[in-house]
């Protein structure tokens, strides 16, 4: 079985990834548009996130507003919302499973069951990581595509915001953490034990005869 250190490392990375997904979800910096004024005082930045957009003045003053309508939002934004929320829920399930299957917890007595639970937790974290990387990469792809598209007005050309980098980091942590937990192999103590048991039983039988 993988060492406890590897297991703790896997859980720690996955939990950090889970927290990063929540941060990525909450931060309104998925797409950024900078409007440079005639002087630095009039420069402004518009941040667009999954739930709201913000206007940031050059003075640092920031005001945010939740989107007016859910129905009128683009499909990719609606899909990103759904995938990131599902990823948070799935990663939460992974955290729960990793606690249950942890070597240093007593939720399960059977070492084999613990190891299997930890592998399931690893797979769950891998799934959560994939669910984050898809919307983040798709948004980045659209931003880059629109940036070089002459049919997209300059006022609609965005840049990649900090949330996308947080999202990539989150998916990396979840995939790495999940991968480490999947390295947990079930204990191989079953076969030697059953062999001893059958041998003992046959000896008893011969004595009876």
């Amino acid at each position: 079985m993988a060492s406890m250190g590897l297991q703790v490392m896997g859980i720690a990375l996955a939990v950090l990834g889970w927290l990063a997904v929540m941060l990525c979800c909450a931060l309104p910096m998925w797409r950024v548009t900078a409007f440079i004024g005639s002087n630095i005082v009039t420069s402004q930045t518009i941040w667009e996130g999954l739930w709201m957009n913000c206007v940031v003045q050059s003075t640092g003053q920031m005001q945010c507003k939740v989107y007016d309508s859910l129905l009128a939002l683009p499909q990719d934004l609606q899909a990103a919302r759904a995938l990131v929320i599902i990823s948070i829920i799935v990663a939460a399930l992974g955290v729960l499973l990793s606690v249950v299957g942890g070597k240093c917890t007593n939720c399960l007595e059977d070492e084999s069951a613990k190891a299997k639970t930890m592998i399931v937790a690893g797979v769950v974290f891998l799934l959560a990581g994939l669910m984050v990387i898809v919307p983040v990469s798709w948004t980045a792809h659209n931003i880059i595509q629109d940036f070089y598209n002459p049919l997209v007005a300059s006022g609609q050309k965005r840049e990649m915001g900090a949330s996308l980098y947080v999202g990539w980091a989150a998916s990396g942590l979840l995939l790495l953490g999940g991968g480490l937990l999947c390295c947990n192999c079930p204990p191989r103590t079953d076969k030697p034990y059953s062999a001893k048991y059958s041998a003992a039983r046959s000896a008893a039988a011969s004595n009876y005869v």
Partner: antibody
Framework: QVKLLQSGAELVKPGSSVKLSCKTS????????MSWLKQVPGQSIEWIGN????????HYNQKFKNKATLTVDTSSSTAYMDLSSLTSEDSALYFC??????????????WGQGTLVTVSS | DTVLTQSPALAVSPGERVTISCRAS??????MNWYQQKPGQQPKLLIY???HLESGVPARFSGSGSGTDFTLTIDPVEADDTATYYC?????????FGVGTKLELK
């Protein structure tokens, strides 16, 4: 360049409906919002609503929620507005516009030439 | 709804500086835009985000303000500037326009 070409003037009877069109070109229609606005000649402008051309999702000014229906045809890059149960108060110049500024922080850069709707018996 | 109050009319001589004001009933941050409309034409965007000049618009036009008080300045005014000027906010839902300020030249 961006072009928005609206349908011609309409003279309609009270209680009837009318469908206005706005044919677009020069931009990626299915990745854009389209807006509709109303102006009574000599008066101010009112925003009716926005439609996202990609999937037809709409966001209306509550005042026009039961009056206007916004639709799009992505194959012809055309936006439509249906006005129902027309009264004399609906007599106005209707503009389609292509907004910039993101999901809801809109300013209207490109405008159609306007369609004059006259409701009269 | 956010009400935008504009002075209804102004008369100035060519070459002068004119300021058109727009006051919002509640804060609109810097989401204030200005349009020029000439008779029989569609509105034309001049200023967006309170102070950003739309491309192709002469530098004679400038905008300022934030929160509830905004101004559009034309310096110097030319004969071609005879039109109605509308302010429009897009921070609060629904997006609203001012009643318009009719600019006439003496």
């Amino acid at each position: 360049q961006v072009k928005l070409l609206q349908s011609g003037a309409e003279l309609v009877k009270p209680g009837s409906s009318v469908k206005l069109s706005c044919k677009t070109s020069g931009f990626t229609f299915n990745k854009s919002y389209m807006s509709w606005l109303k102006q009574v000649p000599g008066q101010s402008i009112e925003w009716i609503g926005n439609i996202y051309a990609g999937h037809g999702g709409t966001h209306y000014n509550q005042k026009f929620k039961n009056k206007a229906t916004l639709t799009v045809d992505t194959s012809s890059s055309t936006a439509y507005m249906d006005l129902s149960s027309l009264t004399s108060e609906d007599s106005a110049l209707y503009f389609c516009a292509r907004p910039d500024g993101g999901y809801n922080l809109n300013w209207f850069v490109y405008w159609g030439q306007g369609t004059l709707v006259t409701v009269s018996s | 709804d956010t009400v935008l109050t504009q002075s209804p009319a102004l008369a100035v001589s060519p070459g002068e500086r004119v300021t058109i004001s727009c006051r919002a009933s509640e804060s609109v941050t810097t989401l204030m835009n200005w349009y020029q409309q000439k008779p029989g034409q569609q509105p034309k965007l001049l200023i967006y985000l309170a102070s950003h000049l739309e491309s192709g618009v002469p530098a004679r036009f400038s905008g300022s303000g934030s929160g509830t008080d905004f101004t559009l300045t034309i310096d110097p005014v030319e004969a071609d500037d005879t039109a109605t000027y509308y302010c429009q906010q897009s921070w609060n839902d629904p997006k609203t326009f001012g009643v318009g300020t009719k600019l006439e030249l003496k």
